[in-house]
């Protein structure tokens, strides 16, 4: 099996996880995408998904999770707002492609949420310039009930669909060791 890699994100309660999942534009632009949590020894559980077919840059909100699919850029934006300690866990983005199994987008995300220090600047929701306001019009999409048992134990083989070259001038070395940096407040 392909070795699964993870990005680790260490945040404090009340902060926002704001990450992207890249996908191959031509192949998956309108496919339904989902955000899943993987608990030890269990199959992935879908927490939120886009509509089917996925609508361009149309926010879908499920509780504190907001998904936005930017078709023109091959980018799914995932936000988890007002994080709680119990949100800690292993997450992944997948693309639904029935009748085939979901396609996992590398890498998985290991989220560690710890108690915040009260009064710490920048640790709460109002410390940003509009960036984490929940969109006024959001849709809750119905997610397929099935999940893939295979994604619990192994990832699909890496292909050019999963990793492509940088879009511009910085030629990142050690692609497998690329820095893992979240964007959050």
């Amino acid at each position: 099996a392909t070795k699964l890699t993870e990005e680790k994100y260490e945040l404090k309660e009340g902060q926002t996880l704001d990450v992207k999942c890249d996908y191959t534009l031509e192949k998956f632009a309108s496919s339904q995408k989902a955000w899943q949590i993987i608990r030890d020894g269990e199959m992935p559980k879908t927490l939120a998904c886009t509509e089917r077919p996925s609508k361009n840059s149309h926010p879908v909100q499920v509780g504190r999770i907001i998904l936005e699919d930017y078709h023109d850029h091959g980018l799914l934006r995932v936000r988890m707002v007002n994080l709680q300690v119990e949100d800690s866990g292993l997450y992944q983005c997948v693309i639904y492609q029935p009748p085939k199994e979901p396609h996992m987008l590398f890498d998985r995300i290991r989220l560690v949420v710890t108690k915040g220090f009260s009064g710490t600047p920048g640790s709460n929701e109002n410390s940003t310039q509009n960036v984490y306001k929940i969109p006024p019009t959001t849709t809750k999409a119905l997610c397929p009930l099935y999940t893939s048992p295979r994604t619990v134990t192994q990832a699909p083989p890496k292909s050019t669909a999963d990793v492509s070259t940088p879009d511009s001038e910085i030629n990142l070395t050690n692609v497998t060791d690329i820095i893992r940096v979240p964007v959050f407040n």
Epitope: R77, G122, Q129, N130, P166, D167, I178, I179
Partner: antibody
């Protein structure tokens, strides 16, 4: 190779506003990330905020909130930083910095401020 | 905000010397650290990202190490063009914060 060209030097009165532009060429602008960093004379670097143009909204350091507005125009691949209620301590060189989007294998937007503009000197003096 | 403390604030060295600059974060930042070089009247230049990955085009005499709270930038053999000010920056959380800088001067 991405290049960033910033607007020219400005001299402003206290209490006024300044808007600095940063035009990108040669790269994917919309889904990349733009940061604004300033440097007061003889001082270190200070991150003011950043924006991913396709998202339309920006994040800024708490110190500048209420005074700074960061925007981006995808059609012209130009980012802007407007600072209001200027005071003498805002005298500094203002840089824009570009983080190209890396497709695949990573989930973040900012990983390093890889390409920098030439800087715009803003002098605030009565 | 995460505070980044660099040491020393300045150092004098000769061409060929091995130079080490340290950067300490006020809380754990995993490996989310970058190093920059800045020369007088110039914009900063990216040297290292992810604590230890060399930016494309940067000479291999530059290396970075560390994780958590303690990080190091090493120049294995100082060259004349390396005399400059060096900054670390954390990318773990907003606001992205810089260290105060280390000025490397000619002895």
């Amino acid at each position: 190779q991405v290049q960033l060209v910033q607007s020219g030097a400005e001299v402003k009165k206290p209490g006024s506003s300044v808007k600095v532009s940063c035009k990108a060429s040669g790269g994917t602008f919309s889904s990349s990330a733009i940061s604004w960093v300033r440097q007061a004379p003889g001082q270190g670097l200070e991150w003011m905020g950043g924006i991913i143009p396709i998202f339309g909204t920006a994040d800024s350091a708490q110190k500048f909130q209420g005074r700074v507005t960061i925007t981006a125009d995808e059609s012209t691949s130009t980012a802007y930083m407007e600072l209001n209620s200027l005071r003498s301590e805002d005298t500094a060189v203002y840089y824009c910095a570009f983080t190209p989007r890396y497709r695949g294998s990573s989930h973040h937007y900012f990983y390093a401020l890889g390409v920098w503009g030439q800087g715009t000197t803003v002098t605030v003096s009565s | 905000d995460i505070q980044m403390t660099q040491s020393p604030t300045s150092l004098s060295a000769s061409v060929g010397d091995r130079v080490t600059i340290t950067c300490r974060a006020s809380q754990g930042i995993s490996s989310w650290l970058a190093w920059y070089q800045q020369k007088p009247e110039k914009a900063p230049k990216s040297l290292i990202y992810a604590a230890s990955s060399l930016q494309s085009g940067v000479p291999s005499r530059f290396s970075g190490s560390g994780s958590g709270t303690d990080f190091t930038l090493t120049i294995s053999s100082l060259q004349p063009e390396d005399f400059a000010t060096y900054y670390c920056q954390q990318f773990n959380s907003y606001p992205l914060t810089f260290g105060g800088g280390t000025k490397v001067e000619i002895k």
